[in-house]
Interface confidence: low
């Protein structure tokens, strides 16, 4: 049987080497000479030769200093043979434990740790965590028992101990109130990790803490009074630029300004925010009226996109806006005037007066009237009074100039301001109908075939309006009824059918047709009738010598 005491060897031992560790014995040495040898890691496998054994005495020796952090345990096998080389024992496992020395200092996992904390964070708020490791034995010794401390804080303001570090975990927390990004946006801590629970080897690292923004500063007007001027009637005109400062982080919701006009019930102004520099751009939302109000004193408040984190006073500014008078065009009242007038209205008589008002009540101005568009040249206007009268006969049935019984004229009014301003009014003459048009036939030229002639429809047209139109009355005159007949084509008597009574010779005929409207206004029209050498429905045929209708009776 083997006799092997437990084996341990401290790392980093001084020489001289080789150094005895233990003496190995086999009980078989009582029966004869025993020779010892070892195999395994550190003996005959790498690292070779760290351990040796005296062949005859069994003394196990170490030949060089050990490093626990490289190899903490060696596993060897001891062998015993007799002088003839036969094994007298089974090989025995030998464990050599390398005991730890505090030969490694802690190492931080990063040279610089980065963290952040909200300004105004309360004590106890966790900020970040730093971590260090130590290669030494943390199971059987305190050689890797790390304790964390803060060595320094830069700046040491507003208190030199703004933060604390958990000695065991490395978690950094806020310990003092007063974190203010606007005063001290970053803190640099030098943190230490020391083994032996803080009493041994140490190392340092840097923790950089960024203080993040909260909306704890209001935007403030600077200056708080502004002046601007704007011409009347112009919308979207920049009046002035409002300046604010906000100590919070630029281009964040806590910095971005929101402007509110406190006394603009009419919504006549608007303030937009310049996203680049946070300026307030005051503009007109709609045109202002100098004659109504010459000056506005606006009170503008400024806040941020997000609510204030703490109770803050809202900054206000006063803006005096002067409205500048502009010469405005006279305004016709109404802008479109409708006048009903009979088409037989007397020439030279006054139809109506159409006048404009001068908006510039603060300027004494004279208005002059002119007719701008009068396509039929029917009208004239008094340049001083705006009285409009006829210069020629009106005609409702002048369809070139009259649409839907309405004649449109444009009137202009010009003031004597500087520069001159001109306003336009529209005059609509609604022309009432007079029965001044008799009915007429359409067509007036008609073709029949000599054989089996097809009756022809003649429409009756009257340019007037009801009741000066249908039902019409038609009558053949001057003996035309001898050869021709007419009958009404429809109940409204707006068309008739003409046909010959008998076979007619090829040739041209004139037929006198008397047409009368519902108000008994009549007119005799001569129809040009051609009888052609054809049968049934006639197209246009060659002209023959005219035959007077009266001669054909």
């Amino acid at each position: 049987d083997w006799v092997i005491p437990p084996i341990s060897c401290p790392e980093n031992e001084k020489g001289p080497f080789p150094k005895n560790l233990v003496q190995i014995k086999s009980n078989k040495d009582k029966e004869g000479k025993v020779f010892y040898s070892i195999t395994g890691q550190g003996a005959d496998t790498p690292p070779v030769g760290v351990f040796i054994i005296e062949r005859e005495t069994g003394w196990l020796k170490v030949t060089e200093p050990l490093d626990r952090e490289r190899i903490a345990t060696y596993t060897l096998f001891s062998h015993a043979v007799s002088s003839n080389g036969n094994a007298v024992e089974d090989p025995m496992e030998i464990l050599i434990t390398v005991t730890d020395q505090n030969d490694n200092k802690p190492e931080f996992t990063q040279e610089v740790f980065k963290g952040s904390v909200m300004e105004g964070a309360l004590p106890g708020t966790s900020v970040m965590e730093v971590t260090a490791t130590d290669a030494d034995d943390d199971v059987n010794t305190y050689n890797a028992a790390i304790a964390y401390t803060i060595l320094s804080q830069d700046p040491e303001l507003p208190d030199k101990n703004m933060f604390t570090i958990n000695r065991n975990t490395g978690v950094i927390s806020v310990v003092t109130t007063g974190l203010d990004r606007e005063s001290f946006p970053t803190y640099t801590l030098v943190v230490q990790a020391a083994d032996l629970q803080g009493e041994g080897l140490s190392t340092t690292a840097t923790a950089v803490i960024t203080v993040t923004d909260t909306n704890d500063n209001p935007p403030i007007f600077n200056p708080t009074t502004y002046k601007g001027q704007v011409p009347e009637n112009e919308a979207n005109v920049v009046i002035t630029t409002l300046k604010v400062t906000d100590a919070d982080a630029p281009n964040t919701p806590a910095w971005e300004a929101v402007y509110t006009i406190l006394n603009d019930d009419g919504g006549q102004f608007v303030v937009t925010t310049n996203p680049v520099n946070n300026d307030g751009i005051l503009k007109t939302a709609k045109g202002l009226d100098f004659e109504a109000k010459q000056q506005y004193i606006l009170h503008v408040a400024v806040t941020n996109v997000v609510p204030f984190e703490v109770s803050l006073t809202t900054s206000t500014a006063t803006v005096t806006v002067d409205v500048l008078d502009v010469n405005e065009a006279p305004i016709f009242v109404p802008p479109e005037k409708r006048v009903e007038v009979s088409e037989d209205f007397g020439v030279g008589q006054e139809i109506t007066s159409y006048t404009a008002q001068e908006p510039d009540t603060f300027m004494e101005q004279k208005i002059t009237y002119r007719i701008w568009r009068d396509t039929a040249n029917w009208l004239e206007i008094n340049p001083d009074t705006g009285a409009i009268s006829t210069r020629a006969e009106l005609d409702r049935e002048d369809f070139e100039h009259v649409k839907n019984s309405t004649y449109t004229a444009l009137i202009i009014a010009t003031d004597n301001g500087s520069p001159v301003a001109t306003g336009t009014g529209t005059l609509l003459l609604i022309l009432s109908d007079v029965n001044d048009n008799a009915p007429i036939p359409e067509p007036r030229t008609i073709f029949f075939c000599e054989r089996n002639p097809k009756p022809q429809v003649i429409n009756i047209i009257d340019a007037d309006l009801p009741p000066n139109t249908s039902p019409f009355t038609a009558e053949l005159t001057h003996g035309a009824s001898a050869n021709w007949t007419i009958q009404y084509n429809d109940p409204t008597q707006e068309s008739i059918i003409l046909k010959p009574k008998m076979a007619l010779e090829v040739g041209d005929y004139k037929i006198n047709l008397k047409l009368m409207d519902n108000q008994n206004k009549d007119q005799v029209t001569t129809l040009e009738v051609s009888v052609c050498d054809c049968e049934g429905a006639a197209g246009v045929c060659r002209k023959a010598q005219p035959v007077e209708a009266g001669l054909q009776i």
Epitope: P253, V258, T303, P307, F308, E309, S311, L312, T314
Partner: antibody
Framework: EVQLLESGGGLVQPGGSLRLSCAAS????????MSWVRQAPGKGLEWVSA????????YYADSVKGRFTISRDNSKNTLYLQMNSLRAEDTAVYYC??????????WGQGTMVTVSS | QSALTQPASVSGSPGQSITISCTGT?????????VSWYQQHPGKAPKLILS???KRPSGVSNRFSGSKSGNTASLSISGLQAEDEADYYC???????????FGGGTKLTVL
């Protein structure tokens, strides 16, 4: 003890108006932004409106913009919600809540608003 | 802006742990550490249980914890108890006029 107590709820016809109040006690009311949050029957929570501690800034959900107005009277420790042009979809329990570091705390017990013809 | 996304329901047995997620965008959950969680029992007002992702107000059990990764925040409840059965809502501060977004709510059932 911190307390918020809403009142002013009730039945109103579509197109009608109501004014809710929320009386605060037990904390410095003027230092707190305040919000109204509503909960339709059987539904989830919906933020409606918020106002800064000073009353200078107001915020509205798109669904109520132009119809509801939030205001506060710090001298009376009271928050208000003026609701105009009410619609059936505005039917809900309305809660007032303190608003800081944006979260809602404390909460009132709620007041029921029913919009129905 | 649409609501934050929460699962409609989760369940667990007494003593177990559960997690409720709350997913938003880089304009809300991802942009700020202003995520809060609320517990609401039927017929009662909501109660703040976590603010600024993981901060517990005084009086709230340490069984409630919060975390955030990217655009998703999470509420974890360990050692489930019968009284934890309630609706849970997340909120996030958001860029723009909406100010505060709510999640759709998650019904927690303790089996």
């Amino acid at each position: 003890e911190v307390q918020l107590l809403e009142s002013g709820g009730g039945l109103v016809q579509p197109g009608g108006s109501l004014r809710l109040s929320c009386a605060a006690s037990g904390f410095t009311f003027s230092s707190y932004a305040m919000s109204w949050v509503r909960q339709a029957p059987g539904k989830g929570l919906e933020w409606v409106s918020a106002i800064s501690g000073s009353g200078g800034s107001t915020y509205y959900a798109d669904s109520v913009k132009g119809r509801f107005t939030i205001s506060r009277d710090n001298s009376k420790n009271t928050l208000y919600l003026q609701m105009n042009s009410l619609r059936a979809e505005d039917t809900a329990v309305y809660y007032c809540a303190g608003t800081a570091k944006p979260s809602f705390d404390p909460w009132g017990q709620g007041t029921m608003v029913t919009v129905s013809s | 802006q649409s609501a934050l996304t929460q699962p409609a329901s989760v369940s667990g047995s007494p003593g177990q742990s559960i997690t409720i997620s709350c997913t938003g965008t880089s304009n809300d959950v991802g942009a700020y550490n202003y995520v809060s969680w609320y517990q609401q029992h039927p017929g009662k007002a909501p109660k703040l249980i976590l603010s600024e992702v993981n901060k517990r107000p005084s009086g709230v059990s340490n069984r409630f914890s919060g975390s955030k990764s990217g655009n998703t925040a999470s509420l974890s409840i360990s050692g489930l108890q019968a009284e934890d059965e309630a609706d849970y809502y997340c909120t996030s501060y958001t860029m723009g006029s909406t100010f505060m977004l709510f999640g759709g709510g998650t019904k927690l059932t303790v089996l």
